[in-house]
Interface confidence: medium
Amino acid sequence: QGWQAFKNDATEIIPELGEYPEPPPELENNKTMNRAENGGRPPHHPFETKDVSEYSCRELHFTRYVTDGPCRSAKPVTELVCSGQCGPARLLPNAIGRGKWWRPSGPDFRCIPDRYRAQRVQLLCPGGEAPRARKVRLVASCKCKRLTRFHNQSELKDFGTEAARPQKGRKPRPRARSAKANQAELENAY
């Protein structure tokens, strides 16, 4: 009965084995998660362009319980949140506030999930339901990736490795399942 005291947080549940939806966008900037000091940015180096390798992502660990309808995971899972300023970036003077602000210089680099891991969890349900086994997809590492334009389609490019990604500004969707289908799966009636 240890599940009774669990927090009502959720981590994405893989609908089917082998099917990997993108993590929800709010994972990358969620108030309830661990935050890096100084907004996750690297130390200030005024007017100096840094090499991309010096602006690696921060991998912030956070722990949450998996939920599926009325059920809670027996144990919390630990995941990473990708945070930080990817270079090259410059610290430029802000004329209005006499302060400084960061602006990307050159290609648009993003600190995003790089690798994922699947973890099987046991979900405990209240009373009359048997425990459920579920596989969850968790962020395992982060990487700075570069956004470029190619034939009118945006791609996120790894340094040296090309990986097709959803278009910039568009909410990522599961490959084999529409957002609508996913939502329907989440809406239950009892």
Epitope: N8, P24, T32, G127
Partner: antibody, heavy 119, light 107 residues
Framework: EIQLQQTGPELVKPGASVKISCKAS????????MVWVKQSHGKSLEWIGN????????SYNLKFKDKATLTVDKSSSTAYMQLNSLTSEDSAVYYC????????????WGQGTSVTVSS | DIQMTQTSSSLSASLGDRVTISCRTS??????LNWYQQKPDGTVKFLIH???RLKSGVPSRFSGSGSGTDYSLTISHLEPEDIATYYC?????????FGGGTKLELK
């Protein structure tokens, strides 16, 4: 202090819809499931459904599946319940409640919103 | 759905009395039962979780007990502020259901 502030009383015509809100404060809105409960005049409490603000995913009591639509706005820490095709049977006080650290336990309640359906 | 029956819809008692409110379920709910208090102004307060676990801040004169299909809420020494309607609720499975309520009145 944890507070759930609900909108004031509503007087609506049969067949119309109404959307009532529940603004949460004093805790991290996405950390706790929000629950909606109906209390008809002089009667008991009925569980309408739950919504997980983290994902915005609802679970409904089958009885209210076609009657209620639960949504959230994370930016304003507000939960909403829309009631459709209203009839006199829907006249009631509707409560939002926060499921606390213990599963199934509604440890904080709004003050209730009275909905009266009348022509 | 699990039916929750509070046999007494109302109870009369005097201040200082020991009061017991009962709740019966249509099937064994394995202690997955909560108690709530609703004041005459409509304010609802959570009292007891999992049959007998008192919520922090709830006076110790409140206690809960039971198992299987029979549960009860006891107020050991009735105070004026305890005048309210009390509801049991199960969370054994979905849908959660509530008892019909027991209204506590002063003699």
């Amino acid at each position: 202090e944890i507070q759930l502030q609900q909108t004031g009383p509503e007087l609506v015509k049969p067949g119309a819809s109404v959307k009532i809100s529940c603004k949460a404060s004093g805790y991290s809105f996405t950390d706790n499931i929000m629950v909606w409960v109906k209390q008809s005049h002089g009667k008991s409490l009925e569980w309408i459904g739950n919504i997980n603000p983290y994902y915005g995913s609802p679970s409904y009591n089958l009885k209210f599946k076609d009657k209620a639509t639960l949504t959230v706005d994370k930016s304003s820490s507000t939960a909403y319940m829309q009631l459709n095709s209203l009839t006199s049977e829907d006249s009631a006080v509707y409560y939002c409640a926060r499921e606390g650290g213990n599963y199934g336990s509604l440890d904080n309640w709004g003050q209730g919103t009275s909905v009266t359906v009348s022509s | 759905d699990i039916q929750m029956t509070q046999t007494s819809s109302s109870l009369s008692a005097s201040l200082g009395d020991r009061v017991t409110i009962s709740c019966r379920t249509s099937q064994d709910i394995n202690n997955f039962l909560n108690w709530y208090q609703q004041k005459p102004d409509g304010t609802v307060k959570f009292l007891i979780h999992h049959t007998s676990r008192l919520k922090s801040g709830v006076p110790s004169r409140f206690s809960g007990s039971g198992s299987g299909t029979d549960y009860s809420l006891t107020i050991s020494h009735l105070e004026p502020e305890d005048i309210a309607t009390y509801y049991c609720q199960h969370y054994y499975n979905l849908p959660w259901t509530f008892g019909g309520g027991t209204k506590l009145e002063l003699k």
